[in-house]
């Protein structure tokens, strides 16, 4: 049984996969910073965390997935605010009973230390310090991101 | 009640560098788009570039070449380089408070009165 | 680069009557960043929409914008001596910002 929470995230995920395909972006667009091949968005406003999801879907972006430790690190240093929350793209799948990113992947324990418990309508905040577990109900700001497309020469065959 | 209110010399001679700054009063410099836009005389507005968190900028491509602008949280201000100019640079200089695309304010939702920067020699 | 055509150019009325102002833009502007401003001379132009539809901090409910895609409009329902101005759309969504050329409305 998938909560209210992973059906949201399935569902524009599943309509963002139907999107045709769109030319590799070369550059982050205006207002969107550039954190090595990510163009990342910090919002302004607060929402829950599927309204942060949706918003993210309507600007052709996903809720922010982090790969690594030192990813996080470096996205935690363009947070300016010590106290203030963003959501990324991770929320606890009950059906699973792990930490799932929302691109279906599941979380790698020693990715990010966790502060909060793991449990039903619990999502993933960031904050300029620590990573915690919080009720996806909550109305705090998000990160949206887009993919840069790596720029690879071209080989052509000799004619 | 945020207020912007720009700085800096109203005559410029040609091929020297235009240099204003706009203090921020009355709110948090950080987490906004701080943008220049510039008006010549009887003409209409064009957007020239903007700075957030310090180390993120963004211009117009038309002037890219000649433009810095910086911030300075600490002071609560932002300022504009303009290098190289000649008349065409002649404008009301306005500094603006940018919303961006992501927050409860969005485009330029506060101004300053606008300076006049003239450049003749 | 989004070029925005306005029109028209100067609108002549009287107080109390209703304004339409069109801009219309040389691509999509998704997502509707589309914004109008108020200008008065010696001043520094005010928002009034943001949005394309929704109404600034302070702005009169006798503003109301609407349009999407390419095609947008600003309505001044009745207008008050202090709207007599011009009127600048704006996109906000593609590098770079651009500004139509403004429509003027002068007093009739």
């Known amino acids: 049984q998938k909560s209210s929470i992973e059906k949201c995230s399935v569902d524009i995920q599943q309509s963002r996969n139907k999107t045709t395909e769109r030319p590799g972006l070369l550059n982050c667009p205006i207002y969107w910073q550039q954190l090595r091949e990510k163009c990342l968005l910090f919002s302004h406003t607060v929402n829950p965390w599927n309204n942060s999801l949706a918003d993210c879907s309507t600007k052709e972006s996903s809720l922010l997935l982090i790969r690594d430790k030192d990813e996080l690190i470096h996205t935690q240093n363009l947070i300016r605010d010590k106290a203030i929350l963003f959501w990324i793209g991770l929320n606890f799948s009950l059906s699973e009973k792990n930490w799932k990113w929302i691109n279906g992947s599941f979380l790698n324990s020693n990715d990010l230390e966790i502060r909060g418990d793991a449990k039903e309508n619990s999502c993933i905040s960031i904050s300029q310090t620590s990573v915690y577990s919080e009720y996806c109900s909550t109305e705090i700001r998000w990160i949206c991101q887009k993919e840069l497309t790596p720029v690879r020469n071209k080989v052509y065959p000799d004619s | 009640q945020v207020h912007l209110q720009e700085s800096g010399p109203g005559l410029v001679k040609p091929s020297e560098t235009l240099s204003l700054t706009c203090t921020v009063s009355?709110?948090?410099?950080?987490?906004?788009?701080w943008s220049w836009i510039r008006q010549p005389p009887g003409k209409g507005l064009e957007w020239i570039g903007y700075v957030y968190n310090s180390e993120s900028t963004y211009y117009n491509p038309s002037l890219k070449s000649r433009v810095t602008i910086s911030e300075d949280t600490s002071k609560s201000q932002f300022s504009l380089k303009l290098s190289s100019v000649t008349a065409a640079d002649t404008a009301v200089y306005y500094c603006?408070?940018?919303?961006?695309?992501?927050?409860?304010?969005?485009?330029?939702?506060?101004w300053g009165q606008g300076t006049m920067v003239t450049v003749s020699s | 680069e989004i070029v925005l055509t306005q029109s028209p150019g100067t609108l002549s009325l009287s107080p109390g009557e209703r304004a339409t102002l069109s801009c219309r833009a040389s691509?999509?502007?998704?997502?509707?960043?589309l914004a109008w401003y108020q200008q008065k001379p010696g001043q520094a132009p005010r928002l009034l929409i943001y949005?394309?539809?929704s109404r600034a901090t302070g702005i009169p409910d006798r503003f109301s914008g609407n349009g999407s895609g390419t095609d947008f409009t600003l309505t001044i329902s009745r207008l008050e001596p202090e709207d007599f101005a011009v009127y600048y759309c704006?996109?906000?969504?593609?590098?770079?910002?651009?500004f139509g050329p403004g429509t003027k409305v002068d007093i009739k």
């Open positions: 009355g709110g948090s410099i950080i987490s906004y788009y």
């Open positions: 704006q996109q906000y969504v593609n590098s770079p910002i651009t």
């Open positions: 691509q999509s502007v998704s997502s509707n960043y």
């Open positions: 949005g394309a539809s």
């Open positions: 603006a408070r940018d919303g961006g695309i992501v927050g409860l304010t969005a485009a330029f939702d506060i």
